[in-house]
């Protein structure tokens, strides 16, 4: 099994994966296989009303760049508070002894898995016991020294919506063959999206591929700078009883998902007032309604908040509220 896989994101579309070779490989490691899969956001995120008092936005951090070659602190859960990090204590003699035993056990266990559990996959279509799972069609990059061509995942995840994640069968999962190195830059990923990465060490290429048990690691790409901005105009309609219906377009490709909108409005000469609009409420109104407004000139601006934080405020929109008691009831709306 490849050791100590570390995944970090250095941009909104890339994840860097690094690992160490198995401590006691069965034969020579010829290559590594890296698979990656987009993770759906936790369904609980869709259920919560983030406009409720006291409900904090979910902690969703991307996987920050490496601090040092051997640092593993970014392997912690993405929900963990980074302020809780601390240095590791020096190892005791008993710990060192235990690690040696574990290393020995790992070697024996891997031998067992290779010889007993795993049947080598047949690449030919001849008779005999074949792996019942779909064969993983590989884009072979040849035995190029330190060059790895990144395979974009755009085609694997058609952009049908910002929150639904397609489940693709195993043979369609994007993957990469890595030769002569212990790192890979995975490119063409979606911004601020969690990925589950699977890493295998292989000690034979042809005719039968023999690979280790997979090591897994998770990472989230960095946010896209303007992805949470509301694009297009904020429009309004004024109904009777001084109800103003504000409407806007949701960001097309937000960072994760939009959890709420902030509406900031003020009447000329008055203090600014704030309104929180939940996902659910937005779905009902395609915006929100301001009720019981006093007559006067108003300005309003709106910003979206995603899993990654706030987008930019829109340019102000202006409207005028008349005293509806003085207006005929058949005013065009």
């Amino acid at each position: 099994v490849p050791l100590d896989p570390i995944s970090v994101s250095n941009s909104s579309s890339q994840i860097i994966l690094k690992w160490k070779p198995p401590s006691d490989p069965n034969g020579n490691i010829t290559h590594y296989l890296v698979f990656w899969e987009r993770q759906a956001e936790d369904s609980e995120l869709f259920e919560l009303d983030y406009c409720l008092k006291g409900l904090k936005l979910p902690s969703r951090t991307w996987s920050p760049p490496f601090e040092s070659e051997d640092s593993q602190k970014h392997n912690q859960s993405e929900y963990e508070d980074s302020a809780g990090e601390c240095c590791s204590c020096p190892k005791t003699d008993s710990q060192i002894l235990k690690e040696l035993e574990e290393s020995s056990f790992r070697k024996t266990f891997e031998d067992y898995l290779h010889n007993v559990v795993f049947v080598p996959r047949k690449t030919s279509s001849g008779t005999g016991a074949e792996d019942p799972r779909p064969s993983r069609k590989r884009r072979s990059l040849g035995d190029v020294g330190n060059v790895t061509v990144a395979v974009p995942t755009v085609a694997a995840f058609p952009n049908t919506s910002s929150t639904s994640v397609p489940t693709s069968p195993e043979e369609h999962r994007p993957f990469e063959k890595v030769v002569n190195k212990e790192s890979l830059v995975i490119s063409g990923l979606r911004h601020f999206t969690g990925y589950r990465i699977e890493l295998q060490a292989c000690n034979q290429d042809t005719p039968e591929e023999r690979c280790s048990v997979a090591a897994y690691v998770s990472a989230r790409t960095m946010p896209e700078a303007k992805a949470d901005d509301i694009v297009g105009p904020v429009t309004h309609e004024i109904f009777e009883n001084n109800v103003v219906h504000l409407m806007w377009q949701e960001p097309k490709e937000p960072n994760g998902l939009i959890v709420l909108y902030e509406v900031s409005y003020r009447r000329y000469g008055d203090e600014e007032l704030h309104l929180c609009v939940s996902r659910k409420h937005f779905a009902l109104e395609r915006g929100c309604r301001l009720r019981g407004l006093s007559p006067g000139n108003y300005s309003v601006r709106i910003r979206a908040t995603s899993l990654a934080g706030n987008g930019s405020w829109t340019e102000p929109t202006y409207f005028y509220v008349t005293d509806y008691l003085d207006v005929p009831s058949n005013i065009a709306k």
Epitope: S43, L48, A283
Partner: antibody, heavy 116, light 108 residues
Framework: EVQLVQSGAEVKKPGESLKISCKGS????????IGWVRQMPGKGLEWMGI????????RYSPSFQGQVTISADKSISTAYLQWSSLKASDTAMYYC?????????WGQGTLVTVSS | SSELTQDPAVSVALGQTVRITCQGD??????ASWYQQKPGQAPVLVIY???NRPSGIPDRFSGSSSGNTASLTITGAQAEDEADYYC???????????FGGGTKLTVL
Amino acid sequence: EVQLVQSGAEVKKPGESLKISCKGSGYSFTSYWIGWVRQMPGKGLEWMGIIYPGDSDTRYSPSFQGQVTISADKSISTAYLQWSSLKASDTAMYYCARWDAGYSPWGQGTLVTVSS
Amino acid sequence: SSELTQDPAVSVALGQTVRITCQGDSLRSYYASWYQQKPGQAPVLVIYGKNNRPSGIPDRFSGSSSGNTASLTITGAQAEDEADYYCSSRDSSGDQWVFGGGTKLTVL
């Protein structure tokens, strides 16, 4: 393409239970309300109720409150309309539709026939 | 709950303009949406909001609103426009929806 696909026609006896489904695709199912509408033979459209699959918040028309149950399973992008005890007067075409400042698109409809 | 009232039937000569109306108190607070339904088919949204057409709906369809009345206008009616038309709106509370009784449009 945004689509709602409903389950097939049903023939039931009075007193039986029934659950019909409406599967959404091509959009984020949890982000839009789904309404249910009844159309009795030769009659107009009647609004029954609506559900937000994100948290299963549901609102019913007073005419249908207690008569039917609307639910959703967001893991399979499906909304449901169910009866615990059907009556002959429940014979109708039932449509689901996505709310997006108007109901669009609509499912193809599920014909429910209740007859002894 | 609110009620929306529509004329049961309206006819129009081919190529002429026809207006279908919908009345109800909830229309003072919410716009109507309009649906076309042909025999044996599911309804289709033709107008929503102040006067918005979904993609694929011909521009001969338009909507307007004044006071407690919403109108659907078909300018230059075609034979394929013959159908039942329903208006719908949220009720005054905003928590429920209501449909009008429907208007059967005949194109002569």
